[in-house]
């Protein structure tokens, strides 16, 4: 078997064996090495010398195998746009941002650029749980049977109705999607002014 060519090597068909780690240099019609993530081209290749790479300076990065002569500048997560940092910028990776708690991504261009406050879910509903936090606005769904939620909130969850018998009490008024069960002492009638409250 023939030995594998090592960059730089001639290429007549303008393609290189390893598309990820090599690139075609048209001036000399050769295949040269790309620079690995975290580095950039400090000296271009020639027919007798392969690409020379150097590490990106602090606060700059290149994410992929490349033949760039500069590194990209790290950008902070913009709190004015509702973003917060989850992972720092390194020579190999841009700063990783996400929406701040209670916000969702309202504008997406390859990555999130702008977050907005999540909508409130009205009493009797809760926000449908999403696979990824911050991906979309709340979709409010009704509380399932036997549960209630009594506030307007972006994050409140439906809670199970109180079971009066577990507390040695009896039910005075059944729970609804928006209110808990009202319990009373089995020996007392419920006074009119106390309706809608729980008596212990």
């Amino acid at each position: 078997s023939q030995p594998q060519a090592v960059p730089p090597y001639a290429s007549e068909n303008q393609t290189c064996r390893d598309q990820e780690k090599e690139y075609y240099e048209p001036q000399h019609r050769i295949c040269c090495s790309r620079c690995p993530p975290g580095t950039y081209v400090s000296a271009k290749c020639s027919r007798i010398r392969d690409t020379v790479c150097a590490t990106c300076a602090e606060n700059s990065y290149n994410e992929h195998w490349n033949y760039l002569t500069i590194c990209q500048l790290c950008r902070p997560c913009d709190p004015v746009m509702g973003l917060e940092e989850i992972a720092p910028c390194t020579s190999k990776r841009k700063t990783q941002c996400r929406c701040q708690p209670g916000m969702f991504c309202a504008a997406w261009a390859l990555e999130c650029t702008h977050c907005e406050l999540l909508s409130d879910c009205p009493p009797g509903t809760e926000a449908e749980l999403k696979d990824e936090v911050g991906k979309g606005n709340n979709h409010c769904v009704p509380c399932k049977a036997g549960h209630f939620q009594n506030t307007s909130s972006p994050s409140a969850r439906c809670q199970p109705h109180t079971r009066c018998e577990n507390q040695g009490l009896v039910e005075a008024a059944p729970g609804t999607a928006q209110s808990d069960t009202t319990c009373k002492n089995p020996l007392e009638p419920l006074p009119p002014e106390m309706s809608g409250t729980m008596l212990m």
Partner: antibody, heavy 121, light 112 residues
């Protein structure tokens, strides 16, 4: 030879302060991020803080945020950890470590011998 | 925070045999440009930790080739192909994809 040597550990009362230092030699100190990692008695490793080569970026574990401050003096090849409002749970051996690659956080390839911090009344 | 779960907790091995340690992460450590933000460390008894593997599968300088790292996404393995007496100690995995950086709980390797 690349070397890291920690100092400044000792016994301190809860609520007290301590300043750890790490003297580096054998490499271009300003070109590398540096970290502090601690190990409580009989327990595993816990990352505490990391600082970039220039000192412009700092990162902290939630358990020490607001109490500990990492800093560096590149002219003296020294890494520091100022520890305030110390708690019993901060008791540990504190290691300083050099990050393998310039401007990265993967691979702490050189570690000091550690300095012991005991927080007790 | 990313949770790193190592298994087993303790691993008795026979000299010359192979050994594998597992590290499972609560979210993927595979970054978009294809590298994996996972390191492996060994802490020998009475010593400071030492770096074995960085970026998932790259051996650190001076580390014997009997150590190898593999895996993708959330499941990773450190393999010691022929265990030697000097390999005893506690092995830790660590993620560096996001702060706070987090370690696994450790796996103690001892000779049977």
């Amino acid at each position: 030879e690349v070397q890291l040597l920690e100092s400044g550990g000792g016994l301190v009362q809860p609520g007290g302060s301590l300043r750890l230092s790490c003297a580096a030699s054998g490499f271009t100190f300003s070109s590398y991020a540096m970290s502090w990692v601690r190990q409580a008695p009989g327990k595993g490793l816990e990352w505490v803080s990391t600082i970039s080569g220039s000192g412009g970026s700092t990162y902290y574990a939630d358990s020490v945020k607001g109490r500990f401050t990492i800093s560096r003096d590149n002219s003296k090849n020294t890494l520091n950890l100022q520890m305030n409002s110390l708690r019993a749970e901060d008791t540990a051996v504190y290691y300083c470590a050099k990050v393998r690659d310039n401007w990265n956080y993967d691979g702490m390839d050189v570690w000091g011998q550690g300095t012991t911090v005991t927080v007790s009344s | 925070d990313i949770v790193m779960t190592q298994s087993p907790l303790s691993l008795p091995v026979t000299l010359g045999e192979s050994a594998s340690i597992s590290c499972r992460c609560s979210q993927s450590l595979l970054y978009s440009s294809g590298y994996i933000d996972l390191d492996w460390y060994l802490q020998k008894p009475g010593q400071s930790p030492q770096l074995l593997i960085y970026l998932g599968s790259n051996r650190a300088s001076g580390v014997p080739d009997r150590f190898s790292g593999s895996g993708s996404g959330t499941d990773f393995t450190l393999k010691i192909s022929r265990v030697e007496a000097e390999d005893v100690g506690v092995y830790y995995c660590m993620q560096t994809i996001q702060t706070p950086l987090t370690f696994g709980g450790g796996t103690k390797v001892e000779i049977k």
